[in-house]
């Protein structure tokens, strides 16, 4: 699976998840959330060689496609698969509230 | 949507999806399939923007994230949402036989 | 140019709900709270709750006991308050207004027109 | 729940004068070093609109004739060289603690 315990520790020039941080202030203009201050959200990076962890028979076809016309613009794309929540602190007037964002974190990729 | 009514009738520069004709043996190196002789796949290309048909917050989150940090290369890709069969004939010995091909045309794309 | 966009004037008879809209432009309508505050005639401004879009987070006054549900549709970029159990005492104009953007609870930097909810036998 | 109470409930103001509109808040609306204090106008037939923001920030778009000051449960609105334009229901708002809350109006 390319997902985090695999990538992170590869040199994966494929399809891969990569660590990436964001400032909810900085890299959102988000100031509402309390904690954290930031997060290991990652993205998916990296060529879909044919047949480099293909989501649908559709992909798997595009990719045999391309392998046939390389200079084709239709090719698969790395995107998330596996998706965490965050959990959050933020504050209502005075009084701290606890949320859970969902689909924040990205835990693996694939090729679609 | 970014389906074929849509994308097929306009000249939308952001991610939207593209015609695409696939020849079995030509494009695939497949002489199995009897007929159809191709058919037309399509395939999901162009920009994604924030706001444009993100599929998960993760990708929201990350193209806000693509907006304070123009020259990241962190950012969302253009991808198939809605898929269809592809009904085929092919032969078993010289027996004709009918399967569809499930998740083999895209109708309609999104930003993941 | 931000805009806030309001359904229009509502008659309802008392015990029914009502459902008001709020279509959105111009802005990350995912990424800033709204607001629901309502203004009885010839009286002030009530907050009643609010809501995040993105996931769909609300916070409410106690005032309204529960009656007033906040939704976001975010494929239309449009915020909706519900008012259920109405009374004689829920006529009023309901607006609903964008937090500034600093805090949950803040100002609201943009309004919509405002929707008059009239409750009547 | 913090209460809002705005002195004068009316007040008329001849053209180029200076107008004065006082809040006082049940408890103090200070807190990490901000007064989390706002003033709107509310125009006849209008909706309210943001003038001031954190007890003396002017809203962007906003004239400079009107400013706002105060801090813990104490604050002001002050309008120079009032215009005719003016004219409308002034109300302070807090956001420190929950329920967020509006002054009853100064008119």
């Known amino acids: 699976a390319l997902d985090t315990n695999y990538c992170f520790s590869s040199t994966e020039k494929n399809c891969c998840v990569r660590q990436l941080y964001i400032d909810f202030r900085k890299d959102l203009g988000w100031k509402w959330i309390h904690e954290p201050k930031g997060y290991h959200a990652n993205f998916c990076l990296g060529p879909c060689p044919y047949i480099w962890s293909l989501d649908t028979q559709y992909s798997k076809v595009l990719a045999l496609y391309n392998q046939h016309n390389p200079g084709a613009s239709a090719a698969p794309c790395c995107v998330p698969q596996a998706l965490e929540p965050l959990p959050i602190v933020y504050y209502v007037g005075r009084k701290p509230k606890v949320e859970q964002l969902s689909n924040m974190i990205v835990r693996s990729c694939k090729c679609s | 949507a970014l389906d074929t009514n849509y994308c097929f009738s306009s000249t939308e520069k952001n991610c939207c999806v593209r015609q695409l004709y696939i020849d079995f043996r030509k494009d695939l190196g497949w002489k199995w399939i009897h007929e159809p002789k191709g058919y037309h796949a399509n395939f999901c290309l162009g920009p994604c923007p924030y706001i444009w048909s993100l599929d998960t917050q993760y990708s929201k989150v990350l193209a806000l994230y693509n907006q304070h940090n123009p020259g990241a290369s962190a950012a969302p890709c253009c991808v198939p949402q809605a898929l269809e069969p592809l009904p085929i004939v092919y032969y078993v010995g010289r027996k004709p036989k009918v399967e569809q091909l499930s998740n083999m045309i895209v109708r309609s794309c999104k930003c993941s | 140019e931000v805009q806030l966009v309001q359904s229009g004037a509502e008659v309802k008879k008392p015990g029914a709900s009502v459902k008001v809209s709020c279509k959105t432009s111009?802005?990350?309508?995912?990424?800033?709270?709204m607001n629901w505050v309502r203004q009885a005639p010839g009286a002030g401004l009530d907050w009643m709750g609010q809501?995040?879009?993105?996931?769909?987070?609300?916070n409410y006054n106690e005032m309204f006991e529960g009656r007033v549900t906040l939704t976001a549709d975010t494929s239309t970029s449009t915020a909706y308050m519900e008012l259920s159990s109405l009374r004689a005492g829920d006529i009023a104009v309901y607006y609903c207004?964008?937090?500034?953007?600093?805090?949950?609870?803040?100002?609201?930097?943009?309004w919509g027109q405002g929707t008059l909810v009239t409750v009547s036998s | 729940d913090i209460v809002m109470t705005q002195t004068p409930p009316s007040l008329s103001v001849s053209p180029r004068e200076t107008a004065s509109i006082s809040c006082r808040a049940s408890?103090?609306?200070?807190?990490?070093?901000?007064?989390?204090m706002h003033w709107y106008l509310q125009k006849p037939g209008q909706s309210p609109q943001l003038l001031i923001y954190?007890?003396?920030n002017l809203e962007s778009g906003v004239s400079d004739r009107f400013s706002g000051s105060g801090s813990g449960t104490d604050f002001t609105l002050r309008i120079s060289r009032v215009e005719a334009n003016d004219t409308g229901v002034y109300y302070c708002?807090?956001?420190?603690?929950?329920?967020?809350?509006f002054g009853q109006g100064t008119k």
């Open positions: 207004a964008r937090g500034y953007g600093n805090y949950a609870l803040d100002a609201m930097d943009y």
């Open positions: 111009g802005y990350k309508f995912w990424f800033y709270w």
């Open positions: 809501i995040f879009p993105a996931w769909g987070m609300t």
């Open positions: 408890e103090s609306v200070d807190s990490y070093g901000n007064s989390f």
């Open positions: 954190l007890a003396s």
């Open positions: 708002q807090q956001n420190d603690e929950d329920p967020l809350s």
